[in-house]
């Protein structure tokens, strides 16, 4: 428990006075917060919170979902915490199966344990398939398992959190990893035709094709030396993972001489930008 020099505000005191507590499912959780300026208890698991304004937190029949961090806070904003594991052989993991990873970043598989004394807490592939050889992870019983430096190749990888309990492997529900690619090159842009010669009244239509790893790529048609918003229509396709194509079609239904000029298809992503132009000449 915390000790502070007299006169300074001190953090609350929690009974039982330990950082971690293990209780069996069905047993009572009884936590006492002692502080003259007690404000509240906060319970947190899977980043969700509940509050209790009584200084004694009592759960008569503990369930696995009562596993988590219990924090007592006083009026000075000082706090103290205890982590409670509710051991339930039928529910070894608490899970949130939403799993997204940004390429080259770490991502957390949220499967905290309800029993810290199980062994070999790790990740396993679904249907007995091995995990990718280069997949590295760090387990944390209170948070889950952190996958280090997500690769594009892990997209739609199916995995389970796994522990050994009494000599047997126990798996969590399935997680499907969805990887968001990092932009590592500028978009590829091309135009259906580099120049057009039209008579007044004819329709001008030109298509720009933008290719990139995801639909997050930005694109627009611009008229050079003009701020006027051009009317464009889009079609887009995913040709498998990380192969996105967009067609942006610019149309002027009845071209006029003063529509003549250079039109630019511009695209950018977080890596950089690219553009391509087409020239329209309208004669009367």
């Amino acid at each position: 428990q915390p000790s502070v020099s007299p006169g300074e505000p001190s953090p609350p005191s929690i009974h039982p006075g330990k950082s971690d507590l293990i209780v069996r499912v069905g047993d009572e959780i009884r936590l006492l917060c002692t502080d003259p300026g007690f404000v509240k208890w906060t319970f947190e698991i899977l980043d969700e919170m509940n509050e209790n304004k009584q200084n004694e937190w009592i759960t008569e029949k503990a369930e696995a979902t009562n596993t988590g961090k219990y924090t007592c806070t006083n009026k000075h904003g000082l706090s103290n915490s205890i982590y409670v594991f509710v051991r339930d052989p039928a529910k070894l993991f608490l899970v949130d199966r939403s799993l997204y990873g940004k390429e080259d970043n770490d991502t957390l598989v949220r499967c905290p344990l309800t029993d810290p004394e199980v062994t070999n807490y790790s990740l396993k592939g679904c249907q007995g398939k091995p995990l990718p050889k280069d997949l590295r992870f760090i387990p944390d019983p209170k948070a889950g398992i952190m996958i280090k430096s997500v690769k594009r190749a892990y997209h739609r990888l199916c995995l389970h959190c796994s522990v050994d309990q009494e000599g047997k492997s126990v798996l969590s529900e399935k997680f499907i990893l969805k990887v968001r690619p990092a932009f590592k090159a500028v978009p590829v842009v091309s135009v259906s035709k580099a120049s057009y010669l039209l008579r007044e009244g004819e329709e001008f239509t030109v298509t720009c094709t933008i290719k990139d790893v995801s639909s997050s790529v930005y694109s627009t048609w611009k008229r050079e030396n003009s701020q006027t918003k051009l009317q464009e229509k889009y079609n887009s396709w995913h040709h498998g993972d990380f192969n996105y194509e967009r067609q942006a079609t610019l149309t002027i239904s009845s071209a006029r001489v003063n529509d003549s000029g250079v039109f630019m298809c511009y695209a950018n992503n977080t890596f950089g930008s690219a553009n391509v132009t087409t020239t329209l000449e309208v004669v009367d």
């Epitope: 939403s98 997204y100 940004k102």
Partner: antibody, heavy 117, light 111 residues
């Protein structure tokens, strides 16, 4: 105890833009993805896009790309959606929804946007 | 884009009987046996409320009268028995693939 608070209504003029808020409480804001959904009587429910937890990356429905912009302020646990160049077709109820365990487990009450001169 | 087609568009069911709503996807919403299909209930002036997630899992606090089934492209929401409070519009939604999409809705009326 998870709550998503949205303003009830916004009245805006055609051509203007509107920035609506979604204030989150009861969970760690930076740990969950926030989605936005548009509802009109004619088009039903349409997914606009998502702002991902942690780094603020976004992904949009192509239909709303350039029309909507999603941002978040971690310090106030608030997600925002800005809609620009408003027309009558943008009149709708806009919801924020938190993704939890693969589904939209919590929704705001919605903001009714009316575009009128 | 994955298109979700709900049928029927509207449905009138007598109190105490069974209501069945169908949702068909234009392509599979399954990955490794997980169906990324969810069902929501919406009443006028309220946001959608989650009923069923991952095709067949009952959301906490939702009565067991609601059940979901199906896989790949064909999914069903069943309410049995129907109660007066179930009058609402029901939507299916997939989040297997961007952009996430919703069905057009089924309006349930209680006779």
């Amino acid at each position: 105890q998870v709550q998503l608070q949205q303003p009830g209504a916004e009245l805006v003029k055609p051509g203007a833009s509107v920035k609506m808020s979604c204030k989150a409480s009861g969970y760690t804001f930076t740990s969950y993805n926030m989605h936005w959904v548009k509802q009109t009587p004619g088009q039903g429910l349409e997914w606009i896009g998502v702002i991902y937890s942690g780094n603020g990356d976004t992904s949009y429905n192509q239909k709303f790309k350039g029309k909507a912009t999603l941002t978040a302020d971690k310090s106030s646990s608030t997600a925002y959606m800005q809609i620009n160049s408003l027309t009558s077709e943008d009149s709708a109820v806009y919801y924020c929804a938190r993704e939890r365990d693969t589904r939209f487990g919590n929704w705001g009450q919605g903001t009714l946007v009316t575009v009128s001169a | 884009n994955i298109v979700l087609t709900q049928s029927p568009a509207s449905l009138a069911v007598s109190l105490g009987l069974r209501a069945t709503i169908s949702c068909r996807a234009s392509e599979s919403v399954d990955i490794y046996g997980n169906s990324f299909m969810h069902w929501y209930q919406q009443k006028p002036g309220q946001p959608p409320k989650l009923l069923i997630y991952l095709a067949s899992n009952l959301e906490s606090g939702v009565p067991a009268r609601f059940s979901g089934s199906g896989s790949r492209t064909d999914f069903t929401l069943t309410i049995d028995p129907v109660e007066a409070d179930d009058a609402a519009t029901y939507y299916c939604q997939q989040n297997n693939e961007d952009p996430y999409t919703f069905g057009g809705g089924t309006k349930l009326e209680i006779k």
